[in-house]
């Protein structure tokens, strides 16, 4: 089970993302924000330091809108 805040790397990170995001899929990196101008990756955010469920969910792909 996923704990509130922990370090996730490699296959464990992928498995957790697949569980959290489900059919939506996920991204390893997000586009840079206007503030930082740098892309951020889930590897850096969750493998190199602890991350929580809310942060994991921000890497889920947005589901396509149904007609």
């Amino acid at each position: 089970a996923y704990r509130p805040s922990e370090t996730l790397c490699g296959g464990e990170l992928v498995d957790t993302l697949q569980f959290v995001c489900g059919d939506r899929g996920f991204y390893f990196s997000r586009p840079a924000s206007r503030v930082s101008r740098r892309s951020r990756g889930i590897v850096e955010e969750c493998c190199f330091r602890s991350c929580d469920l809310a942060l994991l969910e921000t890497y889920c792909a947005t589901p396509a809108k149904s007609e």
């Epitope: 790397c9 296959g11 990170l13 992928v14 390893f28 990196s29 330091r49």
Partner: antibody
Framework: QVQLQESGPGLVKPSETLSLTCTVS????????WSWIRQPPGRGLEWIGY???????NYNPSLKSRVTMSVDTSKNQFSLKLSSVTAADTAVYYC?????????????WGQGATVTVSS | QSVLTQAPSVSGAPGQRVTISCTGR?????????VHWYQQFPGTAPKLLIY???NRPSGVPDRFSGSKSGTSASLAITGLQAEDEADYYC???????????FGGGTKLTVL
């Protein structure tokens, strides 16, 4: 237990491209993060970059324009290419692995490949 | 100039306790990124000594311990032994550089 072995030319001419390969044994290349680090003679460690087999990469900003990392899952190998080399690129080059059991720490290293840039 | 600052050298007599510090900033250690420590003997590859600030991989003696506070981290070695003479490097991730960073290394001499 994962083991790594670097291979490639020990001598590269200035302005040419340095190419190294790291062969992985005892583990699947699709399970971990892979990294390259170098160490110039008598100096400290310098991170070159790392990547995940899915295509996610991150390179040292100071080397980014010259670095390419790739993976060959069929051979269980990953490689480093560094273009337009100069004498400053002379170093021992290490491949390393983040298995994920060590919170992002590089827990498996190759023995290192000495590369000299000289004409 | 390394992003993570380490003293170039430190020394101690056998049996003593020595501490090696690694000073970072708010974009690396202070941002919550884990610190790892490596031990390197001349002519050999570095070996992971401490991971995730304070954890020891299997096989590393409990004489080695790590800690982190604020923007700094420390490696402590108790009961110093002659075979501990080596170079020690800290490593973390830096969000402003978008990459991993190493300290400049500390050479430990056992007197």
């Amino acid at each position: 237990q994962v083991q790594l072995q670097e291979s490639g030319p020990g001598l590269v001419k200035p302005s040419e491209t340095l190419s190294l390969t790291c062969t992985v044994s005892g583990g699947s290349i699709s399970s971990y993060y892979w990294s390259w680090i170098r160490q110039p003679p008598g100096r400290g460690l310098e991170w070159i970059g790392y990547f995940f087999y899915s295509g996610y990469t991150n390179y040292n900003p100071s080397l980014k324009s010259r670095v390419t990392m790739s993976v060959d899952t069929s051979k269980n190998q990953f490689s480093l290419k560094l273009s337009s080399v100069t004498a400053a690129d002379t170093a021992v080059y290490y491949c390393a692995c983040i298995t994920g059991t060590t919170k992002g720490g590089m827990d498996v290293w190759g023995q290192g490949a000495t590369v000299t840039v000289s004409s | 100039q390394s992003v993570l600052t380490q003293a170039p050298s430190v020394s101690g007599a056998p049996g003593q306790r020595v501490t090696i510090s690694c000073t970072g900033r708010s974009s690396n250690i202070g941002a919550g990124y884990d610190v790892h420590w490596y031990q390197q003997f001349p002519g050999t590859a570095p070996k992971l000594l401490i991971y995730g600030n304070s954890n020891r991989p299997s096989g590393v003696p409990d004489r080695f311990s790590g800690s982190k506070s604020g923007t700094s981290a420390s490696l402590a070695i108790t009961g110093l032994q002659a075979e501990d003479e080596a170079d020690y490097y800290c490593q973390s991730y830096d969000s402003s550089l978008s990459g991993s960073v190493f300290g400049g290394g500390t050479k430990l001499t056992v007197l």
